[in-house]
């Protein structure tokens, strides 16, 4: 093959090599960019900045190598358009620092930074942590800070992410109330902070106020939907990002629903209860208090993390005709009480028969000396004789 005269030449089926001295000062308009998985750049003294726009359209890029070039600055969002990037080699450039944000969201298997005049500061605490934790092949590089010694020896006692304290109401909140939340941010080199409110939807009208170091958030005219929803305060500095999530409990009255009994392993009378705080429950059977036992008991399903409603069953283990009747579930919390009833029929009463009915003359054999205490159930056998349930 003839030698490639261009600044960048194809390499393999989806690679590109740019090694001609000083041919590039940016990575705009690389040929065949959208299908590239590998990009190798060397000896580009004029390539000093790597920014978001430079890698736009390189969505398939897996390996990026920029070595022995003039790279001084990599923007925190430079790799936003290359989410599949797994190997990044920026060795032997002029980088003094690299933000934690640059590699956030990437699954880098390899990060090479040797041969750069790194400046030890809290901004490289994340890289020191990679070295400590053996990530990305960093330990093997024995990174040095220019004139300061090994990165591993950099003092880091004062290098912490921001500290957040979110103040929530110190009393319960009712539907229709306004709630003021305050997020107090402490730490060095604070850069940005804000609220994440993606879960709130129609739960309240939101008004943000203030800025670093004290952010205010008013949730106006709250609804019961606000329960179990995360309100998150976040803040970033050169070391990293911190988030704290809180939830606001909004009181509302108990409610209850009952559904038709279903036969599973045991019989189940399904129910749903809601309310904040969580309601206390009581069952009635034919109007009288139902005392739960190991044969009849309430069982809750695993609750959903983001809602107050609880689903469950009144479990009945092998119920007979004596368990047929009216089941009522009472739910109560400080703000209301509710009840729901349902008729359940588990088994016909074998002792109920109409004297007018003809008596069948063909009997199934019955062992009159049977001492078994277990009810015997025979299905689809006709004609049917006398069945006795003992117990």
């Amino acid at each position: 093959a003839a030698p490639c005269p261009d600044a960048c030449c194809p390499h393999g089926s989806s690679g590109l090599r740019c090694t001609r001295d000083g041919a590039l000062d940016s990575l705009h308009h690389l040929p065949g960019a959208e299908n590239l998985t590998e990009l190798y750049i060397e000896n580009q003294q004029h390539l000093q900045h790597l920014e978001l726009r430079d890698l736009r359209g390189l969505g398939e890029l897996r390996n990026l190598t920029i070595v022995k070039s003039g790279l001084r600055f990599v923007a925190p969002d430079a790799f936003h358009f290359t989410p599949r990037l797994s190997r990044l080699n920026l060795s032997f450039n002029a980088l003094e620092s690299l933000s934690w944000k640059t590699v956030q969201g990437l699954s880098l298997q390899e990060l090479v930074l040797s041969g750069n005049p790194l400046h030890c500061s809290c901004a490289l605490r994340w890289l020191q942590r990679w070295e400590e934790e053996g990530l990305g092949g960093v330990p093997e590089q024995k990174l040095q800070c220019h004139g300061q010694g090994p990165l591993a020896h950099m003092p880091n006692a004062s290098c912490g992410v921001p500290t957040l304290k979110v103040q929530v109401p110190n009393a319960s909140v009712d539907v229709g109330d306004d709630v003021l939340l305050r997020c107090q941010v402490e730490g060095r080199g604070l850069e940005q902070a804000g609220w994440i409110l993606t879960e709130l939807e129609q739960s309240a009208t939101v008004m943000k106020s203030g800025g670093l170091p004290s952010l205010g958030l008013t949730l106006a005219n709250v609804t019961s939907d606000l329960n179990r929803k995360n309100v998150t305060c976040w803040a970033e500095n050169d070391v990293g990002r911190a988030e704290v999530s809180v939830q606001v409990n909004v009181s509302f009255p108990a409610s209850v629903q009952l559904h038709t009994a279903v036969e599973m392993h045991h019989w189940c009378i399904p129910f749903s209860v809601d309310g904040q705080p969580a309601p206390s429950l009581r069952w009635l059977f034919n109007g009288s208090v139902l005392n739960e036992t190991s044969f009849i008991f309430t069982e809750f399903l695993e609750p959903a993390a983001n809602e107050t409603v609880r689903h469950g069953c009144l479990r009945l283990n092998q119920p007979t005709h004596v368990n047929n009747g009216n089941y009522t579930l009472l739910a109560a919390n400080p703000f209301g009480q509710a009840s729901a009833s349902i008729m359940a029929a588990f088994m016909d009463n074998p002792f109920e028969f109409n004297p007018e009915d003809p008596i069948p003359v063909s009997f199934s054999p019955v062992d009159t000396n049977s001492t078994s205490g277990d009810p015997v159930e025979k299905k689809d056998e006709t004609p049917f004789g006398v069945s006795v349930a003992v117990g």
Epitope: V168, P169, N170, A171, S172, V173, D174, V175, G176, D177, D178, N221, N249, S251, F252, P253, A254, Q276, P277, S280, R282, A332, N333, P334, F335, G336, Q337
Partner: antibody, heavy 123, light 106 residues
Framework: EVQLLESGGGLVQPGGSLRLSCAAS????????MSWVRQAPGKRLEWVAY????????YYPDTVKGRFTISRDNSKNTLYLQMNSLRAEDTAVYYC????????????????WGQGTTVTVSS | QIVLTQSPATLSLSPGERATLSCSAS?????MHWYQQKPGQSPRLLIY???NLASGIPSRFSGSGSGTDFTLTISSLEPEDAADYYC?????????FGGGTKLEIK
Amino acid sequence: EVQLLESGGGLVQPGGSLRLSCAASGFTFSTYTMSWVRQAPGKRLEWVAYISKGGGSTYYPDTVKGRFTISRDNSKNTLYLQMNSLRAEDTAVYYCARGAMYGNDFFYPMDYWGQGTTVTVSS
Amino acid sequence: QIVLTQSPATLSLSPGERATLSCSASSSVSYMHWYQQKPGQSPRLLIYTTSNLASGIPSRFSGSGSGTDFTLTISSLEPEDAADYYCHQWSSYPWTFGGGTKLEIK
């Protein structure tokens, strides 16, 4: 000093109406829930109405639901109880009470009470 | 609704003695609160959420209990403790009060 001062009580005929007021001072009224509690002669205390801090939520026991309405005017630091279709059994001393703030657990009691105003329903 | 039954209805003790007032709930409640009411006065919060002493209340008052049985104890009676004492539940709608215990100081 927290003060709650009820007014508006008096003698009213069965079926009549009355509006009680409670003037609050010594605390930030709009940050507290409020309730009305009554005590008939020789009887136990009976809670009759609750209102949230902003007035968006109200609760009543079945004995007065549909007849009594609790409201508040936070700009005037005043709590109200509108009582309609009054019955002889509504005769009592009516207290306004402040909901305490003892943490986000819903089970706070009433920590300050007014001196009460007497309502007599009789023909 | 949850019915609160207080016992005894009347308790007559001498100064310095220990007073034990009981409150029984018809169903389990999360917490119990206690109030003191002197003749011609409004109720005064003594104990909140079963065992916490309200602001300004002397330490001779204490509360305990759980579920359906709760107790207010006055460790060493003072003459000014003569009053009616009410228990109160806020756990389940409608909120209810006990019938009261009248404490007399001999």
